[in-house]
C-alpha cells in the first residue's frame, strides 16, 4: 500500500534535481576560474541539507546559510543588474555585457535557476509529485526561501550605481510583491549604493510613452529616495536595438535614443 503523502498545489521537484544541481555546479566552476576551488559534492550536500527531512512549509533563511557559506562569491559590487519580470532580456544583456552580473550569473543563482524542489518532514525523500505553491500553500517553502536568501545577500553586496531592468508591458511595472520589490529594494545599503537606475523595457513597437512617469515607478522612486539612495530612470523603447547596440556600440544607428 503506498504511503500517504502531502499533496501540494505547485509542481513537484524538477526531475533529476540532484544530478542537475551537481552538473550545473561542475560546469560553472569549470567556466569561472575564480570558483575552481568549490567542492561541488559539498555544495550539493549543503543544498540538500537545507530542505531534506524538513517540513516544506517551515523552511527558514538559517537553513540555507551553510549553502550560502560554500557558495560565497565576490562579484564587482558596482556591476550588478537586478531585474523584475523580465529575466530573459536581463540574461541576454549580461551574456553580451560580460562585466555585468545578474543573480543567475552567480554560482548559487545559476544552480537553482528555473528549478523546483522540496522534501518531506522526517523522511530523506525528495518530493517529485508536488511542492508548495507560494500563494496557495505557504510562503516559507524551499524555493521561495532560497530566492529570498540569495536575493537579500546579492542586494546587500551592491554598491555605487545599481541597475534594475523592469518590464514596461506589465500593469505594475514596479511590483512591491516581486522579489525585487519586497527583498532587493529594502536590502540595498544606502552607505554603499549611490544610485538605483531603472531601465523600463517597452514591449510595443509604437510605444513612445514615457513609462518613467508611471505611478508604480514614482512609487519605486519614493521608496528609494526615503532610503537615501538617488533614483534615475530610462526608457528602453526598442529592446532589440538596445541589445544590438550593446553588442556593437560603434554602429552609427546607436547614437539615437533606444
Amino acid at each position: 500500500v503506498p504511503r500517504w503523502r502531502q499533496q501540494w498545489s505547485g509542481p513537484g521537484t524538477t526531475k533529476r534535481f540532484p544530478e542537475t544541481v551537481l552538473a550545473r555546479c561542475v560546469k560553472y566552476t569549470e567556466i569561472h576560474p575564480e570558483m575552481r576551488h568549490v567542492d561541488c559534492q559539498s555544495v550539493w550536500d549543503a543544498f540538500k541539507g537545507a530542505f531534506i527531512s524538513k517540513h516544506p512549509c517551515n523552511i527558514t533563511e538559517e537553513d540555507y546559510q551553510p549553502l550560502m557559506k560554500l557558495g560565497t562569491q565576490t562579484v564587482p559590487c558596482n556591476k550588478i543588474l537586478l531585474w523584475s519580470r523580465i529575466k530573459d532580456l536581463a540574461h541576454q544583456f549580461t551574456q553580451v555585457q560580460r562585466d555585468m552580473f545578474t543573480l543567475e550569473d552567480t554560482l548559487l543563482g545559476y544552480l537553482a535557476d528555473d528549478l523546483t524542489w522540496c522534501g518531506e518532514f522526517n523522511t530523506s525523500k525528495i518530493n517529485y509529485q508536488s511542492c508548495p505553491d507560494w500563494r496557495k500553500d505557504c510562503s516559507n517553502n524551499p524555493v521561495s526561501v532560497f530566492w529570498k536568501t540569495v536575493s537579500r545577500r546579492f542586494a546587500e553586496a551592491a554598491c555605487d550605481v545599481v541597475h534594475v531592468m523592469l518590464n514596461g508591458s506589465r500593469s505594475k511595472i514596479f511590483d512591491k510583491n516581486s522579489t525585487f520589490g519586497s527583498v532587493e529594494v529594502h536590502n540595498l545599503q544606502p552607505e554603499k549604493v549611490q544610485t538605483l537606475e531603472a531601465w523600463v523595457i517597452h514591449g510595443g513597437r509604437e510605444d513612445s510613452r514615457d513609462l518613467c512617469q508611471d505611478p508604480t515607478i514614482k512609487e519605486l522612486e519614493s521608496i528609494i529616495s526615503k532610503r537615501n539612495i538617488q533614483f534615475s530612470c530610462k526608457n528602453i523603447y526598442r529592446p532589440d536595438k538596445f541589445l544590438q547596440c550593446v553588442k556593437n556600440p560603434e554602429d552609427s544607428s546607436c547614437t539615437s535614443e533606444i
Epitope: 567542492d39 559539498s42 550536500d45 549543503a46 550560502m68 536568501t149
Partner: antibody, heavy 119, light 107 residues
C-alpha cells in the same frame, strides 16, 4: 561514547610553531564540519577556524588568518591546527568542537589543550 | 570586539527564573546556540537551532529568538547552574561568533 581529545599544547616562544591534534571517536567523523575554538585566560570563547566535512573548505578568524592552518585526516579521524608565527595573544586553551548539521551548534567539545606563548 | 552582545553578569536565588540575553544583527538570519561552561571545564551545548534542547539537557533551560535578539531562560535555579553562559551564531560572513559571555551567580 562520542568523544574528542585534543593534544599538542605546550609552552612556545613568540614566532614559534605548534601543531595541535584532536582525535575523534564514537561518531562518523567524515560527516561533520569541525571547529577550533580558543579561550584566553579569564576571557570568553573565540572561534578560530572551521573545516568542511570533506576538508575541501576552510575558514579562519581574522586574528589567525595567514598564520594558522586547519586540516583533517578522515581516515584517521583526526583534526589538526598548525599554528605558525605565534604571538603572546595566542595564549589560550584550545578546544576542538564538532558542528551539528553545519550551523545548529557545536554539540561535542574536547577537554581542551593549553598553548602558552611566552619568552 | 564580539558582534554578539551579552550582559557580563546575572544573578538569582535558588528556585528563581533568570533570563540571559544576547543581541546582534547577525542573529536575524542565523541560528543561535547557547553554551554552559562550568568553572574549569569545557563548554557544553545547552540549546541549538534557536530553541531546541539536546537530549540530557533539563527542560528548566529554554530559549527564544526574535529579530536581532535571543534569550536563554533558566527556571528553578539551582546552585549547580552557577557558570558562564555563551550565545553563538554565524556572523554576516557566515563564520562562528560567540557573545562575550554572562557570568551567572546563584546567590
Amino acid at each position: 561514547e562520542v568523544q574528542l581529545l585534543e593534544s599538542g599544547g605546550d609552552l612556545v616562544q613568540p614566532g614559534g610553531s605548534l601543531r595541535l591534534s584532536c582525535g575523534a571517536s564514537g561518531f562518523t567523523f567524515s560527516d561533520h564540519y569541525m571547529s577550533w575554538v580558543r579561550q584566553a585566560p579569564g576571557k570568553g570563547l573565540e572561534w578560530v577556524a572551521d573545516i568542511s566535512a570533506r576538508g575541501s573548505n576552510t575558514w579562519y578568524a581574522d586574528s589567525v588568518k595567514g598564520r594558522f592552518t586547519i586540516s583533517r585526516d578522515n581516515s584517521e579521524n583526526t583534526l589538526y591546527l598548525q599554528m605558525n608565527s605565534l604571538r603572546a595573544e595566542d595564549t589560550a586553551v584550545y578546544y576542538c568542537a564538532k558542528n551539528w548539521n553545519y550551523n545548529y551548534g557545536m554539540d561535542v567539545w574536547g577537554q581542551g589543550t593549553t598553548v602558552t606563548v611566552s619568552s | 570586539q564580539s558582534v554578539l552582545t551579552q550582559a557580563p553578569s546575572a544573578s538569582g536565588t535558588p528556585g528563581q527564573r533568570v533570563t540571559i540575553s544576547c543581541s546582534g544583527s547577525s542573529i536575524q538570519n542565523n541560528y543561535v546556540s547557547w553554551y554552559q561552561q562550568l568553572p574549569g571545564t569545557a563548554p557544553k551545548l545547552l540549546i541549538y537551532r534557536n530553541f531546541e534542547r539536546p537530549s540530557g539537557v533539563p527542560d528548566r533551560f529554554s530559549a527564544s529568538k526574535s529579530g536581532t535578539s535571543a534569550s536563554l531562560a533558566i527556571s528553578g535555579l539551582q546552585s549547580g547552574d552557577e557558570a558562564d553562559y555563551y550565545c553563538a551564531s554565524w556572523d554576516d560572513s557566515l563564520n562562528w561568533v560567540f557573545g562575550g559571555g554572562t557570568k551567572l551567580t546563584v546567590l
